[in-house]
């Protein structure tokens, strides 16, 4: 026998959401235990069906879900899973905050990603940090050249999507570069986009031979200048 | 091609609901957010709703809020706007339009192309 | 809500004269990505709105470079260079910046 425990914590990670006003919420706390535990939930510490709510909810037990279609402010709170067996249990809270402001596009932090210096052979992250109402979805782009040219005849740039990523709203997005060469180096876009548009900034890694004379060994492994 | 084919519309009366559809081809939809932007006869522009582009976030006008709702199926490539408690005000020709997509926008980026519309008429 | 404002609200010109449209925005439109997000459109008698210039200045594929817009953050300008009949319809401008997306009233060009 064994006390009910978390399966997946880091899908539990995000405790606060904080969502758009006409928006889906899913909240998930997916357990295991033995004999196999049950799941309830409470909304500010009193047991939850949404008979009250329009639109109800919807419980997945085999997914220790729970889902809320169409938000609005009277779905603020603090909603808590509870997972019990005979041997023992476990709960998490989440905190909705029901949004009712204006969406907009999504907007970049001012410098980010930054110009970045680097040493053949280290390790680069370039950051992009993404303010955004509603969930944005987030590229990392690089921006190549094809038969000598870094532009087609429409006149925009060839660009090669290096990652995709939906990511929670006022996260940072890192794009980890292992064992810089030569070739990694040239202009980078994080992308970011949601329901509104898009938004996006770049930056240019220069790649240093490891020999650079300029380069001093107390240097760290990438500068990042502006 | 890409095209855009609204259906649906027609004659209603005051408090009755009527769904519209629109029928997107030549682009990969599931990419894309989508809108709904209404004219009614002789005047300009409205925006009514948007949707993203896998349904999870979607925001409407305040005149339409609680009473219309946009939702897609990417699968069969459709967008729809299902209009409920309808007033002679939502008279109009209603029109979907394709909103940003996921990737670098080559051009702009959404609103770049609309359906031919479709005519709503609420009248007793 | 941003409230997009147009002037004129009609406009009769000469073939081959020039042709200004003002559109004022009650909020910035110019985002911290650097563009301006302001769109024109021109609708014709009983078509959709086609667009002309999105993100400020930059012509839209297919439109004639005689179409032209610029401004800055919450006072833009759509210029046709030399009118022609095909140019008849109603011009309206946009903001893309958040939600609700809002239009300017529109403004009507006709042909002398």
């Known amino acids: 026998q064994q006390a009910p425990y978390w399966t997946h914590p880091q899908r539990m990670e995000k405790k606060l959401h904080a969502v758009p006003a006409g928006n889906t919420v899913k909240f998930r706390c997916p357990a295991a235990g033995n004999p196999t535990p049950t799941i309830r939930w409470l909304k500010d510490g009193q047991a939850f069906h949404g008979e009250n709510r329009i639109g109800g909810i919807r419980l997945r037990h085999q997914h220790w879900s729970l889902v809320m279609e169409s938000v609005v402010p009277s779905d603020r709170g603090t909603y808590t899973c509870l997972v019990e067996n005979a041997v023992g249990s476990i709960r998490y809270n989440y905190l909705l905050d029901v949004l009712e402001r204006s969406p907009h596009r999504p907007i970049l932090q001012a410098g980010l990603p930054a110009n970045t210096t680097a040493v053949v052979g280290s390790d680069v992250e370039l950051l992009c940090k993404v303010y955004s109402d509603a969930q944005p979805h987030i590229q990392w782009l690089k921006h190549i050249v094809i038969n000598g040219s870094s532009f087609g005849a429409d006149g925009f740039p060839y660009v090669q999507v290096l990652k995709t990523a939906d990511i929670n709203s006022s996260e940072v997005e890192v794009l980890y570069l292992r064992n810089v060469s030569a070739e990694d180096a040239g202009e980078y876009t994080c992308l970011a986009g949601n329901s509104i548009g898009l938004s996006y900034q770049s930056a240019w890694l220069t790649v240093l031979p490891e020999e650079d004379p300029t380069w001093t060994a107390a240097a760290p492994e990438a500068r990042y200048t502006d | 091609e890409v095209q855009l084919l609204e259906s649906g519309g027609g004659v209603v009366q005051p408090g009755r609901s009527l769904r519209l559809s629109c029928a997107a081809s030549?682009?990969?939809?599931?990419?894309?957010?989508m809108h709904w932007v209404r004219q009614a006869p002789g005047k300009g522009l409205e925006w009514v709703a948007v949707?993203?582009?896998?349904?999870?976030?979607?925001y409407y006008a305040d005149s339409v809020k609680g009473r219309f709702t946009i939702s897609r199926d990417n699968s069969k490539n459709t967008l729809s706007l299902q209009m409920n408690s309808l007033r002679v005000e939502d008279t109009a020709i209603y029109y979907c339009?394709?909103?940003?997509?996921?990737?670098?926008?080559?051009?702009?980026?959404?609103?770049?192309?609309w359906g031919q519309g479709t005519m709503v008429t609420v009248s007793s | 809500d941003i409230v997009m404002t147009q002037t004129p609200l009609s406009l009769s010109v000469t073939p081959g004269q020039p042709a200004s449209i003002s559109c004022r925005s009650s909020?910035?439109?110019?985002?911290?990505?650097?563009?301006?997000?302001v769109y024109w459109y021109v609708q014709k008698s009983g078509q959709p709105p086609q667009l002309l210039i999105y993100?400020?200045?930059n012509r839209f594929s297919g439109v004639p470079d005689r179409f032209s817009g610029s401004g800055s953050r919450t006072d833009f300008t759509l210029k046709i260079s030399r009118v022609e009949a095909e140019d008849v319809g109603v011009y309206y401008c946009m903001q893309y910046i958040e939600a609700p997306l809002t239009f300017g009233g529109g403004t009507k060009v006709e042909i002398k």
């Open positions: 909020r910035s439109l110019l985002h911290s990505d650097g563009k301006t997000y």
């Open positions: 993100e400020l200045s």
């Open positions: 949707i993203s582009y896998d349904g999870s976030n979607k």
């Open positions: 030549g682009f990969t939809f599931s990419s894309y957010a």
């Open positions: 339009v394709r909103g940003a997509g996921r990737g670098y926008p080559y051009g702009p980026d959404g609103f770049d192309i």
